[in-house]
Each structure stands twice: as structure tokens, then as C-alpha cells.
């Protein structure tokens, strides 16, 4: 039967080395065997490149395309092929569809004055445009109480958050995760980082009396 795209490709760029496109076919498809996504930068002399998609689900395909360090002017021509049949054609401007890389190495350290210091790494090298543009969201949740969670917006430059132990339940196990976004690029949120877990051993003041 004929091959059809149900949901056309949606693409995002990490604005440093990779763009990812995802789309849904109208029936279960072996993406890597049946489809190819070609991409070409709209720039004089550019070559046509081919991405072999992988299955994310039965009918969902995803393609990861290596790109050069992105700049605002970059526009790619995208063509989705099933053999000789052109299924979809469109353009993609990475600077207009940014999904930042996931922050890394989230750690929790006890700090002075009954505070926890949460630290993570900025996923971009200092020379990249996004390095100084990221703000973060930190989610802290009680592992045993789904109602007990807090969300912190980190809008200052440093990838750190100081958390008063007294704001958390004593003796409870907590998990934290972090994600990033770039306001000036009107980006989407990054994926969440892996969680890190710790025991909040702060002793409330009343227990000392």
C-alpha cells in the first residue's frame, strides 16, 4: 500500500551539534528500512546529506542529524523519502526551534547554615551562544509523598541552587532533577536530567528543646 505521513516532522536543534526530527506514519513502519530524511543547508555549494531514521514507537520515526555549530541565518531544506516517493518537504531553521541540551552532573552537597547546595553543569561550552542564555527549573520531590514537591526557577547565571533544609521534611528521602531553557531563543525546555537522591537529615529546632 501507499506510505503516508500522519503527523509531519517536528524538529528541534540543540544549537551546537545536533538537530532531531520526529514524525508519525499512518501505520507501523520500519523507519530505517523504508524511509530516508535528506537535509541540505540553504547555502551556496552545500551538499545534500541523508539521515537514516530509527523507530521510537511502531509508527513514530526519529532522525538525529549532525549539524555544524548553528548560527541564526542557517535554514535547512528537509525532504522525507520512501524510496523514490517524496512524502513531505519543508524547511527548518535551527535558531527558531531550539531545545537545549540536558544539564548534567546534578549533585547535592550539605552546606553551611543547614542548607543543601544543588549543583549541575551547563551543557554548553563557554564559546557557544547558549552558554550564557540558559535559565533552569529544578524539581525537588519527596520520594514517599507525591504531594510534597517544589519547583524552583533559577534565573541567575550560576548552575546552583541553595535549599534550606528546613523547607523539606526531616528524615525524608528527596530527589531532584533539573532542566534548562533559553529565553532569548524562545526555546522549548530541555529534557530533565537524571534524578539525584539524598536524605534530608535536618533536625527541626523544636526537637532541641
Amino acid at each position: 500500500g501507499s506510505v503516508k505521513v500522519l503527523h509531519e516532522p517536528s524538529c528541534f536543534s540543540d544549537y551546537i551539534s545536533t538537530s532531531v526530527c520526529q514524525w508519525k506514519m499512518d501505520h507501523p513502519t520500519n523507519c530505517s528500512a523504508e524511509l530516508r530524511l535528506s537535509y541540505q543547508l540553504d547555502f551556496m555549494g552545500s551538499e545534500n546529506h541523508t539521515c537514516v531514521p530509527e523507530n521510537r514507537e511502531d509508527s513514530v520515526c526519529v532522525c538525529s542529524m549532525p549539524i555544524d555549530d548553528a548560527v541564526e541565518a542557517d535554514v535547512y531544506q528537509l525532504d522525507l523519502w520512501a524510496g523514490q516517493q517524496l512524502l513531505w518537504s519543508g524547511s527548518f531553521q535551527p535558531s527558531k526551534h531550539v531545545k537545549p541540551r540536558t544539564p548534567g552532573n546534578l549533585t547535592v552537597h550539605p552546606n553551611i547554615s543547614h542548607t543543601w547546595l544543588l549543583m549541575w553543569t551547563n551543557p554548553y561550552p563557554t564559546e557557544n551562544h547558549l552558554h550564557s542564555e540558559l535559565t533552569y527549573m529544578v524539581n525537588v520531590s519527596n520520594d514517599n509523598d507525591p504531594e510534597d514537591f517544589k519547583v524552583y526557577n533559577v534565573t541567575y547565571m550560576g548552575p546552583t541552587l541553595r535549599l534550606a533544609a528546613s523547607t523539606l521534611k526531616s528524615g525524608a528521602s528527596y530527589s531532584a532533577r533539573v532542566r534548562a531553557w533559553a529565553q532569548t531563543y524562545n526555546s522549548t525546555w530541555s529534557d530533565w536530567s537524571p534524578s539525584t537522591t539524598w536524605l534530608n537529615y535536618y533536625e527541626p529546632w523544636e526537637q532541641h528543646l
Partner: antibody, heavy 125, light 112 residues
């Protein structure tokens, strides 16, 4: 050492055809776009055409569009310019030159970083 | 099409002096910050052209540092300091950003 050697220039009548060749050595030919530039007697430089490294994309000056065809044979490290329906105003020295590196996603640009010695095309009755 | 305009069309300079050639484009040649697709070439009498400057300011291999390029957007300048007799020839600017590529009319440099 990078070398470009053009050949094929000749005296040809208006309406005639000619094929120029440019043999390259000393660099990875398939990784680079190649360009033809011409220079009419006593005049300035005029860009003619460009072809990317794979040969999949070509570009032409309006003055030659539809009459000239640029091509390449990467196995032979050779660039070609097929010139049809030649006119008196096509009389010029034709140079081939190495252009941008197109192997990367965004071509790496170094200008026209090496030129051949040129071959003379004369169109006259 | 992008039109390239060079000034002056001819220039006479004494050895040891500095020569400046201007090139203006009808559209911006800036693709991104630091990437201005403007080159300078020298054609010495009876020879093929040779590259001097690319991307507005980068010297081609083997080009002496007496040659320098500057500018961005639509206005560019080639400066030749401590001019030598060997610098005689016609200097061309060229835009390499989009098809059709285009050269300026050329500037003839004569050494007094």
C-alpha cells in the same frame, strides 16, 4: 603542491560549441567546490559557474545560463565546462579555481584559493 | 544580484606608503557574526589572479601581513602597508555569499 591545468580553449565560430577541461592535483578534489571565472581581453574578472564537491549542485551567471554546463568527474579529478551557442561576447580567458570545501554541512570558505593558468576561448567568424 | 563597487579605479602610490582600496556591496555580505563573505584578489600583469584575503579579514596562505582586510556588512577595505614595486597589478573584491558570485570592477595599483 596544488595544480590546476586548463585546456580546450580554441577559436570557434559564433553558434559553435567547445568543452573546456581543468585537471586538478595536490588536494582532495571531491571535497571542494570548483568555479569557472572568465576575463575578456582588457576587462575585469567575471564569475561564470560553480559546482559543489559531489556535482549535485550547480550555479550559473545569467549571461551563460542555458548555454553553458558545468560538470565534474571526481574519479578523474577533472572539471569541465561545456559551452554551446557561443557568442562573440564569450571571448575570454577562462580560469578554473578551487572554491569552498563542501564536505562539511556548512561549506568552509577560503575564497578562490587556487587558480589555473587560464585557457583562451575566441569566438569569431 | 549583489553588485560590487570598488573605489578608486586607479591608484598611484610611492614605495613605503600605504594604499587603501574600498569595496561596497549592494547587500550585506554578513552571514553570521565574523563571517563576511568578501574576498580580495590580486592579478599581476600577465598572470592569473591570486587570493589575498577571504572572509573579509583572513589572509590567504603565504600572503604577507602588509596586506590587511577590514569591514563588515556592505563596506570593506583592503590596506597595503609599506607598498613595494612587486604589489603592482589590479586588485579585485568579490562576494562569495550567494549566486551569482560577483567581482568589483578592479583597482589598478601603480607604484610611482
Amino acid at each position: 603542491e596544488v595544480q590546476l591545468v586548463e585546456s580546450g580553449g580554441d577559436l570557434v565560430k559564433p553558434g559553435g560549441s567547445l568543452r573546456l577541461s581543468c585537471v586538478a592535483s595536490g588536494f582532495t578534489f571531491r571535497d571542494y567546490a570548483m568555479t569557472w571565472v572568465r576575463q575578456a581581453p582588457g576587462k575585469g574578472l567575471q564569475w561564470v559557474s560553480l559546482i559543489n564537491g559531489s556535482g549535485g549542485k550547480t550555479y550559473y551567471a545569467d549571461a551563460v545560463k542555458g548555454r553553458f554546463t558545468i560538470s565534474r568527474d571526481n574519479a578523474k579529478n577533472t572539471l569541465y565546462l561545456q559551452m554551446n551557442s557561443l557568442r562573440a561576447e564569450d571571448t575570454a580567458v577562462y580560469y578554473c579555481a578551487v572554491d569552498r570545501k563542501t564536505k562539511t554541512i556548512r561549506p568552509q570558505y577560503y575564497g578562490l584559493w587556487h587558480w589555473g593558468q587560464g585557457t583562451l576561448v575566441t569566438v569569431s567568424s | 544580484d549583489i553588485v560590487m563597487t570598488q573605489t578608486p579605479l586607479s591608484l598611484s602610490v610611492s614605495p613605503g606608503e600605504t594604499a587603501s582600496i574600498s569595496c561596497r556591496s549592494s547587500q550585506s555580505l554578513t552571514y553570521s557574526i565574523g563571517y563576511n563573505y568578501l574576498d580580495w584578489y590580486l592579478q599581476k600583469p600577465g598572470q592569473s589572479p591570486q587570493g589575498l584575503i577571504y572572509l573579509g579579514h583572513k589572509r590567504a596562505s603565504g600572503v604577507p601581513d602588509r596586506f590587511s582586510g577590514s569591514g563588515s556588512g556592505t563596506d570593506f577595505t583592503l590596506r597595503i602597508s609599506r607598498v613595494e614595486a612587486n604589489d603592482t597589478g589590479v586588485y579585485y573584491c568579490m562576494q562569495g555569499l550567494q549566486s551569482p558570485l560577483g567581482f568589483g570592477q578592479g583597482t589598478k595599483l601603480e607604484i610611482k
